[in-house]
Interface confidence: medium
């Protein structure tokens, strides 16, 4: 199959990094600057992606591969292939339309991106709160009272049952 195609199509001999130049009797010409071909036999080279503004170059474009972008400090990638850069927030915050906002009570975010998530509801698993949650950290659940040996007790009393997303104060 490939052998017959090579006989039919002189362009199939052009390797990656070149293009089959119809203006020059179908000889293989190198890709011009800022372009690439990642497979052989191409009639044109593809334009390199340019990492401008809030994007920065993670991998330079070469004659055989496209550039790859990431984001400048203070921003993080979103979307396939880092198609967008989104502003970082501090831990304990989330990004809203009005900028970075502190997590509401009962929620936390331990990253510089993403949304605030509700503290774990220890009582749903029959456990007690060992360490209280903060804006930056989830609660730490301890063993259930039944798991404790006689005389032992948890740091805080068992959490009462409550709606998801709420936590003991």
């Amino acid at each position: 199959f490939e052998r017959t195609r090579s006989l039919q199509d002189p362009c199939s001999n052009c390797p990656a990094g070149t293009f089959c130049d119809n203006n020059r009797n179908q000889i293989c010409s190198p890709c011009p600057p800022n372009s690439f071909s990642s497979a052989g036999g191409q009639r044109t080279c593809d334009i390199c992606r340019q990492c401008k503004g809030v994007f920065r170059t993670r991998k330079e474009c070469s004659s055989t591969s496209n550039a790859e972008c990431d984001c400048t400090p203070g921003f993080h990638c979103l979307g396939a292939g880092c198609s967008m850069c989104e502003q970082d927030c501090k831990q304990g915050q989330e990004l809203t339309k009005k900028g970075c906002k502190d997590c509401c009570f009962g929620t936390f975010n331990d990253q510089k991106r993403g949304i605030c998530r509700p503290w774990t509801n220890c009582s749903l698993d029959g456990k007690s709160v060992l360490v209280n949650g903060t804006k930056e950290r989830d609660v730490v659940c301890g063993p259930s009272p039944a798991d404790l040996s006689p005389g032992a007790s948890s740091v805080t009393p068992p959490a009462p049952a409550r709606e998801p997303g709420h936590s003991p104060q």
Epitope: E2, R5, S12, A16, A39, G40, D46, R49, N66
Partner: nanobody
Framework: EVQLLESGGGEVQPGGSLRLSCAAS????????MAWFRQAPGKEREFIGR????????DYVESVKGRFTISRDNAKNTLYLQMSSLRAEDTAVYYC???????????????????WGQGTLVTVKP
């Protein structure tokens, strides 16, 4: 998981038109070249055309130039094949395929592509 799903095939009369779609999921669609191939009964898979990652350059096989147009919408993760002036010899199963990030093979050979859809049948008959 990488997935490609073609749709839009069907039966059409000679001279008619069809638009095929290829919905991609599970990977960075906008970073890869994409191609359409077809396979008629008893024949080998044939390259139709290929579109660059950003839609900036295209390659077509001679037999479809001026009749078929490939386009893509990176926001919708979808590749399209607009077919017009269809002929009986265009009857085949049509496949979309993702171009490898590097291949030593010719752009028109199947080996240059690493993921394929399941195909959609196009029948051209009076």
């Amino acid at each position: 998981e990488v997935q490609l799903l073609e749709s839009g095939g069907g039966e059409v009369q000679p001279g008619g038109s069809l638009r095929l779609s290829c919905a991609a999921s599970g990977w960075a669609f906008g970073n890869y070249g994409m191609a359409w191939f077809r396979q008629a009964p008893g024949k080998e898979r044939e390259f139709i055309g290929r579109l660059a990652w950003n839609g900036g350059s295209t390659d077509y096989v001679e037999s479809v130039k001026g009749r078929f147009t490939i386009s893509r919408d990176n926001a919708k993760n979808t590749l399209y094949l607009q077919m017009s002036s269809l002929r009986a010899e265009d009857t085949a199963v049509y496949y979309c395929a993702r171009q490898r990030s590097y291949s030593r093979y010719d752009i028109r050979t199947p080996q240059t592509y690493d993921y394929w859809g399941q195909g959609t049948l196009v029948t051209v008959k009076p």
